[in-house]
């Protein structure tokens, strides 16, 4: 069973009091219908709350919305709906915060039928004032914010217009029409596609790619044939056309779409998809769906270029298009991703890496739980986690798993301990060192989150009923102590805390409901008087990550390199700060063949780490194109993984071969690389 | 088999300092924490701090900080604790022991294996 | 630093005799606890770390539990070789140890 209050735990001394003088609940005077709420800034305490209430009449249905700050993290609000005259807020355009501490937030207002465009409020600072602006177009999209300069914003129209503002939406431009999708790239510039004869549907797959880098003055365009598009950490990626199939593959450009490279990964038919699962600068996860309506697909692991995959996971659980996938990245341990696989027998099983995709194994067993009815062996199973998927069955599961950077290792997440994932209600389960080992933390399904990085865990009851408890631990979820934070239960709808996990602060959202009506209420407690003091050096300890054999000289080495942490010892009830900073110290590998993934032409056999040369590249459905044009490719079969540190040690070093092969893509010819003015 | 062989007995006089190694053998040396403790006649045990040998982080004992250095070199499996302004309370037997480890924490599995001792003698 | 109080400090016992130790942290520890043994002029061995997990090679009579604040070390039966000083040390804060049980025959 999972640890509870009993004699042995550590407690917090008098929290009852000292909650009770910290937490503090606000009535808003507004009918129940939705919530919405958005943090501006960063420690900066505002929130802003949006209410929206629909009453259907018979011809139209008519809207209300009220907008509230707060500037204490929650334990104040003040209505501010005057300050936007009162207007109705589109709620699926949300609330549109900018990036950083930019203080810029934009709201959607509805508007009436016949109106030349939308129009918006505009703040920048920090939601205390608004601006009223009319725009000429109707949105289609929330404004995008690009994320180099908060002052200029993109948009998409209904009539599909791409429209541009340099002045923080106070004055706009139409800088392309015919526009599908269009983002954000590096240093303020824009992609896009665009059709030529129809409409987006219409002209799947013979879309054109364009690029501006000066807010459409002038463009370039840089593909062709093109189905769709997505950005990636330094790669930007194109599912372009074959000439003569109904098939697409995936090029890839680091040079923000100058030159191409045909990606080392199979085509896909016109009901199958690629997703980019997760990217960063060094490498990237691309989920490649199976031919037929299988649900899975294929998960491939890039080289630094974006161009040779390896195969890393088989029959990777992913429904449709945009559909649910579980893949998790675990941002408290480097290198740590979780996901689902579809059996063979249908059943859905959670697998983890460690290591950047290179191995996936298993959830190794709770200590303190038993097998379920799943398993076979009833000493012998696995513990499976409950993601999106589970979520999109609705399954009794209120959340994902959670992670954060700065609560080193902490992972929490609802499972089941079995062969599979069970349809049973699920237990909450932790783990302290990014998923090694795992520790059934409460019984039953519950809402969760992590304040003070990892100082606290906060926890609330998932039930039908209303709720007037929460729990909290101070021991990374081994001891667990409740606290009745009102004498009304109410009907719980959320759990709310700053982003970042720095905060000591939390928010529960919920109504209570009477004969007569029903009200939005919040109660927000601050945590600081339970974290009586600052953590001091003798607060923390040392841990190495991904420790498994102390025995072994390389114990902790993942991708060329171990990181120790300080990190906070359990039975320290002290604040660790907002201005806390992860204390890590890095010591470099020697190299092992490990380190290396084979390059393009290579494979390795299995259980081998060597590097063999393909017999013939022909049987192996694979084309290779560098830049667009044949190329020689010159390897010694090896590349070293992204990311990876190490030094020394193994150098596979042997002789350098040309390989040789016809590049059949068609993508770009150098005439389509010429560029056009506005 | 993990060894620890520490260097011979000192004698000392107050307000001196005394520096005792600790050479492993057998093992990976630098996977482990080496903690420090000693025992001074007819007393219980008193651990005076340690090191992880990869990286060097040390931490001591609230009581001998600033008067404790306790280092180690990975190129020759060895941790050394100086102790300086030597005092007649310091007289007793000192211990290397290295910190069993299960997991990625260095300390919180027991003292596994111990040295043979060193005797420190401080007497003017 | 977490203080570390160990009682009895002397406790005189037969060969066969149930024999148990206990130990309390001035604060919770969870389970990071360590009991040793020491006889005269050798270094002190480790036979119980977790609380509760045997460390390789000690004889299964001896046996730890406890978690939090209060701790135990049981000799299910007293054999000669076990006449000896005992030590309680916990791992969650600075190291400290306790003051020690000498285990005598009666």
């Known amino acids: 069973s999972a640890p509870g209050e009993d004699e042995e735990c550590g407690r917090v001394r008098d929290f009852v009091a000292k909650l009770a003088n910290n937490t503090h609940q606000h009535v808003f005077d507004d009918l129940r219908g939705s919530v919405s709420l958005s943090w501006v800034g960063d420690s900066t305490g505002v929130i802003l709350v949006l209410t929206t209430f629909h009453v259907p009449l018979v011809i139209m249905t008519f809207g209300q919305s009220k907008l509230y700050r707060s500037e204490d993290y929650g334990k104040n609000f003040k209505d501010i709906t005057d300050l936007i005259n009162n207007t109705f807020i589109r709620t699926e355009f949300g609330m549109a915060i900018g990036p950083e501490n930019s203080g810029k937030v934009v709201l959607t207002a509805e508007v009436s039928g016949g109106s030349r465009g939308g129009r918006i409020f505009r703040s920048s600072d920090f939601a205390k004032n608004f601006v009223q602006t009319d725009l000429p177009f109707h949105p289609l999209t929330q404004m995008m914010y690009s994320p180099q300069n908060s002052d200029y914003l993109l948009a998409l129209s209904t009539e599909n217009g791409l429209w541009v503002s340099k002045n923080f939406g106070g004055k706009w431009e139409e800088i392309h029409k015919a526009v599908c999708l269009a983002k954000w790239g590096s240093d303020n510039t824009i992609f896009f596609t665009t059709y030529a004869n129809g409409s987006c549907k219409a002209d799947l797959g013979a879309l054109e790619l364009w690029r501006t880098s000066d807010l459409g003055k002038s463009f370039k365009t840089i593909g062709v044939k093109i189905y769709s598009f997505g950005l990636g950490g330094r790669f930007l990626f194109a599912s372009v056309m074959a000439d003569k199939d109904t098939t697409r593959r995936i090029h890839v450009s680091t040079d923000q779409g100058d030159t191409w490279s045909m990606a080392q990964l199979p085509s896909v038919g016109q009901e199958q998809f690629y997703s980019i699962l997760a990217a960063n600068d060094d490498m990237v996860f691309m989920h490649v769906d199976e031919p037929g309506d299988t649900g899975f697909g294929t998960i491939f692991t890039s080289d630094d270029r974006g161009i040779v995959y390896s195969k890393s996971l088989d029959r990777h659980l992913y429904t449709t298009t945009g559909g649910e996938t579980d893949f998790t990245n675990v941002t408290s341990l480097r290198g740590v991703y979780i996901t689902s696989v579809l059996s063979e027998d249908n059943s859905i099983q959670t697998m983890i890496t460690f290591d950047q995709g290179g191995r996936w194994t298993h959830l190794r067993k709770p200590e303190n739980s038993e097998c379920d009815a799943t398993a076979k062996n009833k000493n012998e199973c696995s513990l499976h986690i409950h993601a999106s998927y589970s979520i999109s069955q609705k399954l009794n599961v209120p959340m994902a798993p959670l992670s954060e950077p700065n609560a080193v290792g902490i992972v929490i997440a609802h499972g089941s301990v079995g062969d599979a994932i069970s349809v049973m209600v699920p237990d909450v389960y932790i783990s302290d060192d990014g998923g090694y080992s795992w520790t059934k933390m409460l019984e039953g399904p519950h809402y969760y989150t992590i304040l003070d990085s990892g100082g606290i865990i906060v926890a609330i009851e998932h039930s039908s009923r209303p709720i007037n408890v929460i729990k909290f631990s101070t021991d990374e979820g081994q001891c667990w102590q409740t606290y009745t934070f009102t004498r009304d239960p109410i009907y719980f709808t959320g759990l709310a805390s700053e982003p970042g996990a720095r905060s000591m602060n939390i928010s529960i959202w919920g109504f209570t409901e009477s004969a007569l009506t029903s009200q939005w209420v919040s109660y927000t407690i601050d945590f600081k008087d339970i974290l009586e003091r600052n953590c001091e050096e003798k607060d923390y300890t040392i841990w190495l990550a991904h420790s498994t054999d102390p025995e072994d000289y390389e114990d902790g080495c993942i991708l060329g390199y171990k990181e120790q942490f300080l990190r906070l010892r359990k039975s320290s009830v002290c604040q660790n700060g907002r201005d806390y900073v992860v204390t890590k110290q890095p010591s470099i590998c020697l190299c092992s063949l490990e380190d290396f993934l084979c390059d393009f032409g290579y494979y390795r056999p299995e259980n081998d780490s060597k590097c063999v040369e393909q017999p013939e590249l022909k049987g192996h459905d694979l084309e290779f194109c560098l830049y667009g044009r044949e190329e020689h490719l010159t390897t010694n079969g090896y590349r070293k993984i992204p990311g990876d540190k190490c030094q020394g040690g193994v150098n596979p070093v042997r002789e350098v071969k040309d390989l040789k092969k016809k590049c059949t893509s068609n993508f770009l010819s150098p005439e389509k690389q010429n560029s056009k003015s506005n | 088999q993990v060894q620890l062989v520490q260097s011979g007995a000192e004698v000392k006089k107050p307000g001196s300092s005394v520096k005792v190694s600790c050479k492993a053998s057998g093992g990976t040396f630098r996977n482990y924490a080496i903690s420090w403790v000693r025992q001074a006649p007819g007393q219980g045990l008193e651990w005076m701090g340690g090191i992880i040998p990869i990286g060097g982080w040390a931490n001591y004992a609230q009581k001998f900080q600033g008067r404790v250095t306790i280092t180690a070199d990975e190129s020759t499996s060895t941790a050394y604790m100086e102790l300086s302004s030597l005092r007649s309370e310091d007289t007793a037997v000192y211990y290397c022991?290295?910190?069993?480890?299960?997991?990625?924490?260095?300390?919180?599995?027991?003292?596994?294996?111990w040295g043979q001792g060193t005797t420190v003698t401080v007497s003017s | 630093d977490i203080q570390m109080t160990q009682s009895p400090s002397t406790l005189s016992a037969s060969v066969g005799d149930r024999v148990t130790i206990t130990c309390r942290a001035s604060q919770s520890i969870s389970s990071w606890l360590a009991w040793y043994q020491q006889k005269p002029g050798k270094a002190p061995k480790l036979l119980i770390y977790k609380a509760s997990s045997l460390e390789s090679g000690v004889p299964s009579r001896f046996s730890g539990s406890g978690s939090g604040t209060e701790f135990t070390l049981t000799i299910s039966s007293l054999q000669p070789d076990d006449f000896a000083t005992y030590y309680c040390q916990q791992a969650d804060g600075h190291i400290t140890f306790g003051g020690g049980t000498k285990v005598e025959i009666k």
């Open positions: 022991a290295r910190q069993g480890r299960k997991t990625g924490y260095y300390y919180y599995y027991g003292m596994d294996v």
